[in-house]
C-alpha cells in the first residue's frame, strides 16, 4: 500500500513540476525591469526566451520575438536547448509512468517489468527536473552577469555616443515557476526511484542450482531445503543432499535416474 | 551594436517647415522610445519631441503646437515635422533613442546631430 502511495504521489508531483516547467518555458517574465527615467512615458520591460516586451503606462503593449537565431547569446541558446530537453524527458516519462502505476493493470504485465518501468521514469523525472533547474539558473547568472558589466560605461559608436543605462533587471515570476516546477519534477523522480524498490520481486532465498542426489539409495525430498536450514525433522544430521556444491570432475560424472535440474 | 542614421538637416527661413527623420538599426529586440534633442550654441541639451511604441507622445515646451513628432515601428524610424520655425529653433538636433539591446541589458543611443538653421 506504502509503495502504490509513494509512486502515485510520486506521479502526481512529477506531473505538476513539468507542467510548470512547460509554463515557465512559455512566459515572457523571465527579466523584468521598469525604466520609469524617461521623460515621454514610463516603460516596463519584461523578456522570455522567445520574445521581448514592452508596456507602457499607457497599458499599450508590444511584444516582438527573436526571429533570428544568429544574433542570440549563447547562453539563450543553451537555456532554450535545457528548457526543451527537460519538457521532453518529462513528458516521456510521464508517459512511461502512466504504465508503470501499480494502480492501473495493463495485460499480465509482471511486477518486475513495472519496477524498471518506474525506475526508468523517476530518472527521467530527475534528470528533467535537473535541466529545469540548470536552465533557470544559467539565465538568472546571465542577468548578474549582464548587470554588473553594465556600469554606466559610455562608447562612441557608428552612429553616435550610445551610454549604457544602468537600471537592475530583476528576476522575473518565470524564473521562481522554472525553480520550483524543477525541485518538484526532481522531487517527483526520488519518489518514483524510491518506490521502485518496493515494486521489485524479493530474491528468493535458494539459488536456482542443479541438485544431485549423492547415491542411489538417497531420494530428492521436498523437505530437504528445511533440513539444510535446521527447521526440518532431520535431526540426526543425515545428510539428504550436498547442496550442488562439487568440482568439476564431480559434475562430469556418469548420470543417474535419480539426477534432478 | 546599434546606429543611428539622421537627415532632413538645412538651412531654412523662418516661418517654414523642415521634416526630419531618424532611422535605427543593427541587432536589438524592442525600441520603446524615440526622440529628439536639441542643443543651442552655448546652451544645454533639451527634450524637443519624444514618443514610444504605443504613440504616447511629449513635447518641449517652447515647441509644442509647431512641431509633430511621429513614428514607423515596422521600420524602426522616427520623424520630427517642424513647422512654423523661428530662428530661435536654430540648434544641433539629436536623435534619441531607448533599446532594449538584449537579455537584462539595454542602451541609450545618441545619434551624431544634424544642423537645423533658421535664417
Known amino acids: 500500500m506504502a509503495v502504490t502511495a509513494c509512486q502515485g504521489l510520486g506521479f502526481v508531483v512529477s506531473l505538476i513540476g513539468i507542467a510548470g516547467i512547460i509554463a515557465a518555458t512559455c512566459m515572457d517574465q523571465w527579466s523584468t525591469q521598469d525604466l520609469y527615467n524617461n521623460p515621454v512615458t514610463a516603460v516596463f520591460n519584461y523578456q522570455g526566451l522567445w520574445r521581448s516586451c514592452v508596456r507602457e503606462s499607457s497599458g499599450f503593449t508590444e511584444c516582438r520575438g527573436y526571429f533570428t537565431l544568429l544574433g542570440l547569446p549563447a547562453m539563450l541558446q543553451a537555456v532554450r536547448a535545457l528548457m526543451i530537453v527537460g519538457i521532453v524527458l518529462g513528458a516521456i516519462g510521464l508517459l512511461v509512468s502512466i504504465f508503470a502505476l501499480k494502480c492501473i493493470r495493463i495485460g499480465s504485465m509482471e511486477d518486475s517489468a513495472k519496477a524498471n518501468m518506474t525506475l526508468t521514469s523517476g530518472i527521467m523525472f530527475i534528470v528533467s527536473g535537473l535541466c529545469a533547474i540548470a536552465g533557470v539558473s544559467v539565465f538568472a547568472n546571465m542577468l548578474v552577469t549582464n548587470f554588473w558589466m553594465s556600469t554606466a560605461n559610455m562608447y562612441t559608436g557608428m552612429g553616435g555616443m550610445v551610454q549604457t543605462v544602468q537600471t537592475r533587471y530583476t528576476f522575473g515570476a518565470a524564473l521562481f515557476v522554472g525553480w520550483v516546477a524543477g525541485g518538484l519534477t526532481l522531487i517527483g523522480g526520488v519518489m518514483m526511484c524510491i518506490a521502485c524498490r518496493g515494486l521489485a520481486p524479493e530474491e528468493t532465498n535458494y539459488k536456482a542450482v542443479s541438485y544431485h542426489a549423492s547415491g542411489h539409495s538417497v531420494a530428492y525430498k521436498p523437505g530437504g531445503f528445511k533440513a539444510s536450514t535446521g527447521f526440518g525433522s532431520n535431526t540426526k544430521n543425515k545428510k539428504i543432499y550436498d547442496g550442488g556444491a562439487r568440482t568439476e570432475d564431480e559434475v562430469q560424472s556418469y548420470p543417474s535416474k535419480h539426477d534432478y535440474v | 551594436q546599434v546606429q543611428l542614421q539622421e537627415s532632413g538637416g538645412g538651412l531654412v527661413q523662418p516661418g517654414g517647415s523642415l521634416r526630419l527623420s531618424c532611422a535605427a538599426s543593427?541587432?536589438?529586440?524592442?525600441?520603446?522610445?524615440m526622440g529628439w534633442y536639441r542643443q543651442a550654441p552655448g546652451k544645454q541639451r533639451e527634450l524637443v519631441a519624444g514618443?514610444?511604441?504605443?504613440?504616447?507622445?511629449n513635447y518641449g515646451d517652447s515647441v509644442k503646437g509647431r512641431f509633430t513628432i511621429s513614428r514607423d515601428n515596422a521600420k524602426n524610424t522616427v520623424y520630427l515635422q517642424m513647422n512654423s520655425l523661428k530662428p530661435e529653433d536654430t540648434a544641433v538636433y539629436y536623435c534619441?533613442?531607448?533599446?532594449?539591446?538584449?537579455?537584462?541589458?539595454?542602451?541609450?543611443?545618441w545619434g551624431q546631430g544634424t544642423l537645423v538653421t533658421v535664417s
Open positions: 534619441n533613442v531607448l533599446v532594449i539591446s538584449g537579455i537584462g541589458s539595454h542602451l541609450e543611443v
Open positions: 543593427g541587432t536589438f529586440f524592442n525600441i520603446p522610445v
Open positions: 514618443i514610444s511604441t504605443g504613440g504616447t507622445t
